[in-house]
């Protein structure tokens, strides 16, 4: 069987939701010593980066300027050490936002609720769209989808303080082209005695996994890597 290197990790820097005409940055984190990284879009080669010097950095950044609907879709990356290629990374969905119009978001019974009440978000957008998306700030990976002609509903079940936070919705013209975001709706949940101390409000900074953690190798890391390599050989 053909030998391959472990798959790299692909991430979007700051967010996978990129406003049209803005720059998207994707990171591919592979291995020290990788001489080439390839970015693939919808299965085809999209860009190539060669780190300098390859042995001192464990990944690269791919800059995608002037984001538009043609560049929105599924990305993956691979890397090469010598003649050996890695497995393909997981797929990353890159979305273009700020297309066309702005939806409105409403919440029933209202933005201030008590624990145990059932809440429904309603997203409305008059221009032709069939899919709507609801996102909670600080939880942008947890996208809820709903369908409707001009509006869609997002029932939330009995709420707890874990539901507190800011919500926005988008209309979607396809999976990767979204509208402008709605104005945020801040949901306040009170009276959850059992959970209050355990459920702080969600952070308002971007999702922690939407950051590129590319590191330059230090002398110490090199010594550790060499020690690890020697230890592995001894074990063999």
């Amino acid at each position: 069987p053909k030998q391959t290197l472990p798959k790299p990790i692909i991430r979007a820097e700051s967010t996978y939701m990129v406003p049209k005409e803005k720059q998207a940055t994707l990171c591919c984190q592979g291995s020290y010593g990788a001489v080439e990284y390839q970015l693939h879009f919808e299965g085809s080669l999209f860009a190539v980066e060669r780190p300098k010097p390859p042995e001192r950095i464990n990944g690269v950044k791919f800059h995608i300027p002037d984001m538009n609907s043609r560049k929105a879709g599924r990305y993956s990356c691979i890397y090469r050490v010598g003649e050996l290629w890695s497995e393909r990374s997981d797929l990353l969905d890159l979305v273009v936002t700020e297309m066309y119009d702005t939806p409105t978001l409403s919440v029933h019974p209202g933005p201030e609720v008590t624990s145990g009440e059932k809440v429904t978000f309603y997203c409305r957008l008059d221009t032709a769209t069939s899919m709507f998306l609801l996102l909670k700030e600080g939880r942008s990976r947890d996208v809820q989808r709903s369908y409707g002609k001009v509006q869609a509903e997002f029932p939330m079940g009995p709420v707890t303080t874990a539901h507190r936070g800011s919500y926005r919705c988008f209309g979607s013209y396809n999976n990767y082209a979204w509208s402008f975001p709605s104005e945020p709706v801040k949901l306040l949940v009170t009276g959850d005695i059992e959970n209050t101390s355990l459920a702080p409000t969600d952070p308002t900074f971007p999702d922690s996994w939407d950051t590129c953690l590319l590191t330059r190798e230090t002398g110490l890391q090199k010594d550790l890597a060499l020690w690890d390599h020697t230890a592995q050989n001894l074990l063999r």
Epitope: T104, G110, V113, G116, K118, Y122, G157
Partner: antibody, heavy 115, light 107 residues
Framework: QVQLQQPGAELVKPGASVKLSCKAS????????MHWVKQRPGQGLEWIGM????????KYNEKFKSKATLTVDKSSSTAYMQLSSLTSEDSAVYFC????????WGQGTLVTVSA | DIQMTQSPSSLSASLGERVSLTCRAS??????LNWLQQEPDGTIKRLIY???SLDSGVPKRFSGSRSGSDYSLTISSLESEDFVDYYC?????????FGGGTKLEIK
């Protein structure tokens, strides 16, 4: 204080339409849902639908989808419900109720459908 | 649609008596339940929201509670103005639905 003003009565002919009004005061009209509720003489209450004045989101009881149309005029803080193709079954008191949890109620408009 | 079964449909009681009205929900509604009072002239007023929260200006003799799918309105000591109609209302799942009502009469 919060007030929802509705006309006392409307007399309409079978087959005609009527547009009921509900003028809100004492709160931020655009921030809260407005519901409409039907009560037939000596009967219980039935929810017709609701509208959010700010977003224009409407939600109807399927039973009333072809009967009622909800609209708002933000400039006058007034909600409207148009009832079409009226029959004797539509003779009832119609209430508007402000806030998602039905906190504030109008006095109701008695609609009588009669030739 | 969620059915709200309200009982009793009518109740005779005396001044100062403690009474409880009940609504049973056919599906889970969480705490999304109101109790409303309707005067003989048709005026409707909300007494309780979110199962047990008392509206401002409503006398403390009114209280709301829940046990499973049963929701109760209790009046601890009846006064003359309490002999009117009462309705429960669920706002958990659209269409929002009302109980059939309870007519509270003086004995």
């Amino acid at each position: 204080q919060v007030q929802l003003q509705q006309p006392g009565a409307e007399l309409v002919k079978p087959g005609a339409s009527v547009k009921l009004s509900c003028k809100a005061s004492g709160y931020t009209f655009t921030s809260y849902w407005m519901h409409w509720v039907k009560q037939r003489p000596g009967q219980g209450l039935e929810w017709i639908g609701m509208i959010h004045p700010n977003s224009g989101v409407t939600k109807y009881n399927e039973k009333f989808k072809s009967k009622a149309t909800l609209t708002v005029d933000k400039s006058s803080s007034t909600a409207y419900m148009q009832l079409s193709s009226l029959t004797s079954e539509d003779s009832a008191v119609y209430f508007c109720a402000g806030d998602g949890r039905f906190a504030y109620w109008g006095q109701g408009t008695l609609v009588t459908v009669s030739a | 649609d969620i059915q709200m079964t309200q009982s009793p449909s009518s109740l005779s009681a005396s001044l100062g008596e403690r009474v409880s009205l009940t609504c049973r929900a056919s599906q889970d509604i969480g705490s999304s339940l109101n109790w409303l009072q309707q005067e003989p002239d048709g005026t409707i007023k909300r007494l309780i929201y979110a199962t047990s929260s008392l509206d401002s200006g409503v006398p403390k003799r009114f209280s709301g509670s829940r046990s499973g799918s049963d929701y109760s309105l209790t009046i601890s000591s009846l006064e003359s103005e309490d002999f009117v109609d009462y309705y429960c209302l669920q706002y958990a799942s659209s269409p929002w639905t009302f109980g059939g009502g309870t007519k509270l009469e003086i004995k």
